[in-house]
Amino acid sequence: AGLLLIVSPSHPTEGSPVNLTCKMPSLQSSDAQFQFCFFRDDQALGPGWSSSPKLQIANMWKEDSGSYWCEAQTMASKVLRSWRSQINVHRVPVADVSLETQPPGGQVMEGDRLVLICSVAMGTGDITFLWYKGAIGLNLQTKTQRSLTAEYEIPTARESDAEQYYCVAENGYGPRPSGLVSITVRIPVSRPILMVRAPRAQAVVGDVLKLHCEALRGSHPILYWFYHEDVILGSSSAPSGGGASFNLSLTAEHSGNYSCEANNGLGAQRSEEVTLNFTVPTGARSNHLTS
């Protein structure tokens, strides 16, 4: 009677271990007198010849499918060979593909790192992950790896990254797409510019000055604060587009430095100061404004 190769489990799933046991026929003497070797498709496995009749393959992959057998060699160099056993490694198709973001919720500040994490709930073997952008499905990146998650990184997010994204996972059983994820790029305010508008070239006490503050860039809403010598005059909100204005009735005390600040919750930016001076021309009863 020949050797017997026992495979456990007989129908392994990818990524799981398999135990091979080379069983001696009962009429043979003790295993201790033998050296054992396991083979797949004419290739020796593991350590080659060994005194152990057992071999564990820690992770079986689809490409490990094949014809397995074992051999035993006596002290007298007589070689016994088992029948071949066909081992077919079962691949689990990918399922439940999802796309998540870091930071969570799909909101990222301009300039910050954005990571799109593609995950599968199940699936074995080499999984190919693909990331797509926008309705037209522009392929951003493709990665093949033996893991249930893969990442696509945008090191510094820009407005052009504010789009819809999805990913696709595939391991030989057809592509499986995730749902769409919308990315919002939040833009901190740029440094605003303060403009002073007077009703005439030389404003006088009693005139109404219009202070207009405008940041070129920044996600809305933007709150604008107006300052005279670092004292708050007032504030105004711009819910969408454009800047904000503040009306000021001139008095003699209104000479000095003016500035404004823009804040949209992502940080505040202060404008350069604008200096407004009142001069009292000789014999004149009114103060004039120059900037």
């Epitope: 300039g111 510094t156 740029s190």
Partner: antibody
Framework: EVRLVESGGRLVQPKGSLRLSCAVS????????MYWIRQAPGKGLEWVAR??????????YYADSVKDRFTISRDDSQSMLYLQMNNLKTEDTAMYYC??????????WGQGTTLTVSS | DIVMAQSPSSLAVSVGEKVTMSCKSS????????????LAWYQQKPGQSPNLLIY???SRESGVPDRFTGSGSGTDFTLTISSVQAEDLATYYC????????FGAGTKLDLK
Amino acid sequence: EVRLVESGGRLVQPKGSLRLSCAVSGFTFNTYAMYWIRQAPGKGLEWVARIRSKTNNFATYYADSVKDRFTISRDDSQSMLYLQMNNLKTEDTAMYYCVRDNSGSFDYWGQGTTLTVSS
Amino acid sequence: DIVMAQSPSSLAVSVGEKVTMSCKSSQSLLHSSNQKNYLAWYQQKPGQSPNLLIYWASSRESGVPDRFTGSGSGTDFTLTISSVQAEDLATYYCQQYYSYPTFGAGTKLDLK
């Protein structure tokens, strides 16, 4: 493929008017702020006007040198950007570029259209 | 306005040489919100439109060769070309977008 194609530049007399156009394709035009940037012959680059997206109320911004003379506008349905220029001066002579604003830097430029203001 | 000063105004180089050019701003371009420097570099070849090379002072635009490197922070910035190629002969502009945009006067790169 992203394309920005300007047109409308020509020789105009001082105090005259002209409208420049820019036809855009290859990206979602209505989500981006757009600029007109100019370059006088042998000189550097100068921003002229900016218009934000509909989400931002089509807010417009102008360089001091063109304020109250130039008007920037857009037609998202046609993916078109415009620059209406009135009361033109000789110093407005330049190559005018239609440009996409991507987080403050300018990642796509048209080939430019030439405006010459001369009597 | 934020003033951008570029130096040198022109530079004669040989193919294969390493080149550095400077850009200085009149105010810091480092944004407190995200610690990014709001500065870009452009290349303009004769008779062509400008082309974005670098944004946020050091991020290379897609498709730009890795011989182009941007560095610096605050008010002092540098564009380095590690090994100049014939096709790099152009004028290079820096631009700030911390506030209303302003450009430097440019650095013209010529062959020796």
